[in-house]
């Protein structure tokens, strides 16, 4: 009775169960009555990362420096190359196929999370009591100056883009 399903790491072909090729190898011939599945190692700059019946290995990803990419982890016969972006840039997608410059947070916004090679800068509006007067990829919102602790009074209220202006307390005449 020919099988209708096969064990793990096998596949069904011509009414028989054949072994899959291990990661790092490609299929060159299905098993027969007289021989096991025949597999060959992937070539230089190729990989297969699963038990498979692929007749061609996949090419390693190319980290194109013209797109701001560099190699984070070199590929093997069983793993793809992992690309990341040059300093100051981040990937445009999870696959990291190209890079864009880290975004800066405009005045009135501060950096909530600094960008990495794979994620952009996350900005947040400066809440009441905080301000940012620069466009920056690193600066957080700064707290307004506390005039009281300096024995001064607020002469000009702060905004999300400006600090308070402190001045001396009015003397009693």
């Amino acid at each position: 009775e020919p099988p209708t399903a096969c064990r793990e790491k096998q596949y069904l072909i011509n009414s028989q169960c054949c072994s899959l090729c291990q990661p790092g190898q490609k299929l060159v011939s299905d098993c027969t009555e007289f021989t096991e599945t025949e597999c060959l190692p992937c070539g230089e700059s190729e990989f297969l990362d699963t038990w498979n019946r692929e007749t061609h290995c996949h090419q390693h990803k190319y980290c194109d420096p013209n797109l701001g990419l560099r190699v984070q982890q070199k590929g093997t016969s069983e793993t793809d190359t992992i690309c990341t972006c040059e300093e100051g840039w981040h990937c445009t997608s999870e696959a990291c196929e190209s890079c864009v410059l880290h975004r800066s947070c405009s005045p009135g916004f501060g950096v909530k999370q600094i960008a990495t090679g794979v994620s952009d800068t996350i900005c947040e509006p400066c809440p009441v009591g905080f301000f940012s007067n620069v466009s920056s990829a690193f600066e957080k919102c700064h707290p307004w100056t506390s005039c009281e602790t300096k024995d001064l009074v607020v002469q000009q209220a702060g905004t999300n883009k400006t600090d308070v202006v402190c001045g001396p307390q009015d003397r009693l005449r």
Epitope: V28, T32, E33, F34, T35, E36, L40
Partner: antibody, heavy 114, light 112 residues
């Protein structure tokens, strides 16, 4: 049904190269590998190598440096080329289809002699 | 490479006798899948080898049931229960578990 027919030069001078053609029918080269085996007179069988369906090859490591196997799918032909022949390469050369080990060609006799 | 050692080199028999040929491999022929790819061929005088047994004990179609194969791992045996005249020739074992595929040196079955 599956058939294989080997054709070669018969006589080869020492240090010269050998070219043999295997013409197949009853199965398709783009989907099946072809092996080469030889048998010196009165001796045992020796596996030489294989060309797989996709064109990849495996060779007997002892002969790899002077052996090459290629094919022409459109003509259903597989070619064995061996360089620098010596007297002990005198043998009957057989081709056989992968998975069709019940079917061997009649073989072609190659004699290395001056 | 896997070395296949066949014994005896020559086996003189009388017609109707039982014949037994041994084949030993230098390493196990059991593939990780659990299959063992050991074949037996008969080469009659002036002919190409013909397949008798595959995967240790499976008779190829049309092969008489007086031929049987057995064994496991590294030790294999071909038995012919009652030798007939058409069985005479050279018997080869062959392994296709490991590349390169290798053959035994042959056993010549001849009349006493």
């Amino acid at each position: 049904q599956v058939q294989l027919k080997e054709s070669g030069p018969g006589l080869v001078a020492p240090s010269q190269s050998l070219s043999i053609t295997c013409t197949v029918s009853g199965f398709s080269l783009p989907t099946s590998g072809v092996h080469w085996v030889r048998q010196p007179p009165g001796k045992g069988l020796e596996w030489l190598g294989v060309i797989w369906a996709g064109g990849d090859t495996n060779y007997n490591s002892a002969l790899m440096s002077r052996l090459s196997i290629s094919k022409d799918n459109s003509k259903s032909q597989v070619f064995l080329k061996m360089n620098s022949l010596q007297k002990d390469d005198t043998a009957i050369y057989y081709c056989l289809g992968h998975g069709h080990f019940d079917v061997w060609g009649a073989g072609t006799t190659v004699t290395v002699s001056s | 490479d896997v070395v296949m050692t066949q014994t005896p080199l020559s086996l003189p028999v009388s017609l109707g006798d039982q014949a037994s040929i041994s084949c030993r491999s230098s390493q196990s022929l059991v593939h990780s899948s659990g299959n063992t790819y050991l074949q037996w061929y008969l080469q009659k005088p002036g002919q190409s080898p013909g397949l008798l047994i595959y995967k240790v004990s499976n008779r190829f179609s049309g092969v008489p049931d007086r031929f049987s194969g057995s064994g496991s791992g590294t030790d294999f045996t071909l038995k012919i229960s009652r030798v007939e005249a058409e069985d005479l020739g050279v018997y080869f074992c062959s392994q296709t578990t490991h590349v390169p595929w290798t053959f035994g040196g042959g056993t010549k079955l001849e009349i006493k």
